[in-house]
């Protein structure tokens, strides 16, 4: 599946995807989050704060087609993809440009869906088969959630709603991602 288009407004259009875009590859394996570091306790963050400026969980608009077997939605649907590193990130002086830069602080927070919405889509099928209707779950908003370690199982906890919203008015710094990584992120999902 190749890219059909790549827009500059953080909206990717990809043909014939299933119900969900996938989480970024770094979220795909819970083993990285199941290590019993620090005796199974989250590391101490001396600068842990709920200041919204320290979180970079952002919502990217993503347009895709919904598929079910050989059938494809007549129109693409638009939803959000949760992206960015969740804090508590420490704002540290940038020696080069006197600005600030983000330093992610490990896998203790994750930018994941907070709310979903349902949308009914009409799927067109080949070979004269009757159209199908499907109700799909679409990401409606994203949030930083804290990871706690619990019997070596990963568990996501809400982090205060004031830190949950993507930063308005701040241009997010895009992470360098290869086309291959993006492709892995956006494979068929249901």
């Amino acid at each position: 599946q190749g890219w059909q288009a790549f827009k500059n407004d953080a909206t990717e259009i990809i043909p014939e995807l299933g119900e969900y875009p996938e989480p970024p590859p770094e979220l795909e394996n819970n083993k990285t989050m199941n290590r019993a570091e620090n005796g199974g306790r989250p590391p101490h963050h001396p600068f842990e704060t709920k200041d919204v400026s320290e979180y970079s969980c952002r919502e990217l608009h993503f347009t895709r087609y919904v598929t079910d077997g050989p059938c494809r939605s007549a129109k693409p649907v638009t939803e959000l993809v949760c992206s960015g590193q969740c804090g508590p990130a420490r704002l540290l002086p940038n020696a080069i440009g006197r600005g600030k830069w983000w330093r992610p602080s490990g896998p203790d927070f994750r930018c994941i869906p907070d709310r979903y919405r349902a949308q009914r889509v009409q799927l067109l099928c080949p070979g004269g088969e009757a159209p199908r209707a499907r109700k799909v779950r679409l990401v409606a908003s994203c949030k930083c959630k804290r990871l706690t370690r619990f019997h070596n199982q990963s568990e996501l906890k809400d982090f205060g709603t004031e830190a949950a919203r993507p930063q308005k008015g701040r241009k997010p710094r895009p992470r360098a991602r290869s086309a291959k990584a993006n492709q892995a992120e956006l494979e068929n999902a249901y």
Epitope: P23, D68, K135, L156
Partner: antibody, heavy 116, light 111 residues
Framework: QVQLVESGGGLVQPGGSLRLSCAAS????????LSWVRQAPGKGLEWVSV???????YYADSVKGRFTISRDNSKNTLYLQMNSLRAEDTAVYYC??????????WGQGTLVTVSS | DIALTQPASVSGSPGQSITISCTGT?????????VSWYQQHPGKAPKLMIY???NRPSGVSNRFSGSKSGNTASLTISGLQAEDEADYYC???????????FGGGTKLTVL
């Protein structure tokens, strides 16, 4: 073909812990939401927990704070860590694949008995 | 809590049609076409029979059909056969799309 195989059930005392596993094959595991559903002996189906493909987790009130759902996409395996078990948790536990907001494939189930 | 209510039992003779109802609050059945139906034989795992009110997965007989009126969804089985004898459960999801609820189940007896 799609297959879900649960394991890890058994006899445990009240207050004890147990971890269930569900090995999946025949589909792109990481792309699907997955649930645990249980059925007490002679009773109906009860939804327990679901995990999204992003790793977000949700629970029935009856198990919140005691059970933890997780997934390992590298192993195509779903887990349910059950702590502080009670007699009323005795049931057959099924893992089920969630596609388009319904459960299209189910495992054969694993029996958990909580008794002293 | 949201609840789905089903009759405890229904029965019918071979060749007849029967209908199993599933009644819920507007937030889980009435406002959204999201009811699915599962068949469960004794000692076996549930099997999806109907989803999104009236869609049949491939491999499920066209004798099974679903419908919805107001806040009541229904499963109709026509041309009843002995192998249809089983428990049937309706299911829906919560408004958040992140929780599910099952009806109490209906035992179908083929006389």
């Amino acid at each position: 073909q799609v297959q879900l195989v649960e394991s890890g059930g058994g006899l445990v005392q009240p207050g004890g812990s147990l971890r269930l596993s569900c090995a999946a094959s025949g589909f792109t595991f990481r792309s699907h939401w997955l649930s645990w559903v249980r059925q007490a002996p002679g009773k109906g189906l009860e939804w327990v927990s679901v995990i999204g493909n992003w790793g977000d987790t949700y629970y029935a009130d009856s198990v919140k704070g005691r059970f933890t759902i997780s997934r390992d996409n590298s192993k195509n395996t779903l887990y349910l860590q059950m702590n502080s078990l009670r007699a009323e948790d005795t049931a057959v536990y099924y893992c089920a694949r969630d596609t388009y907001l319904h459960f299209d494939y189910w495992g054969q189930g694993t029996l958990v008995t909580v008794s002293s | 809590d949201i609840a789905l209510t089903q009759p405890a039992s229904v029965s019918g003779s071979p060749g007849q049609s029967i209908t199993i109802s599933c009644t819920g609050t507007s937030s889980d059945v009435g406002d959204i076409n999201d009811v699915s139906w599962y068949q469960q034989h004794p000692g076996k795992a549930p099997k999806l029979m109907i989803y999104d009110v009236n869609n049949r997965p491939s491999g499920v007989s066209n004798r099974f059909s679903g419908s919805k009126s107001g806040n009541t969804a229904s499963l109709t089985i026509s041309g009843l056969q002995a192998e249809d004898e089983a428990d049937y459960y309706c299911s829906s999801y919560g408004e958040s799309l992140t929780s599910y609820v099952f009806g109490g189940g209906t035992k179908l007896t083929v006389l």
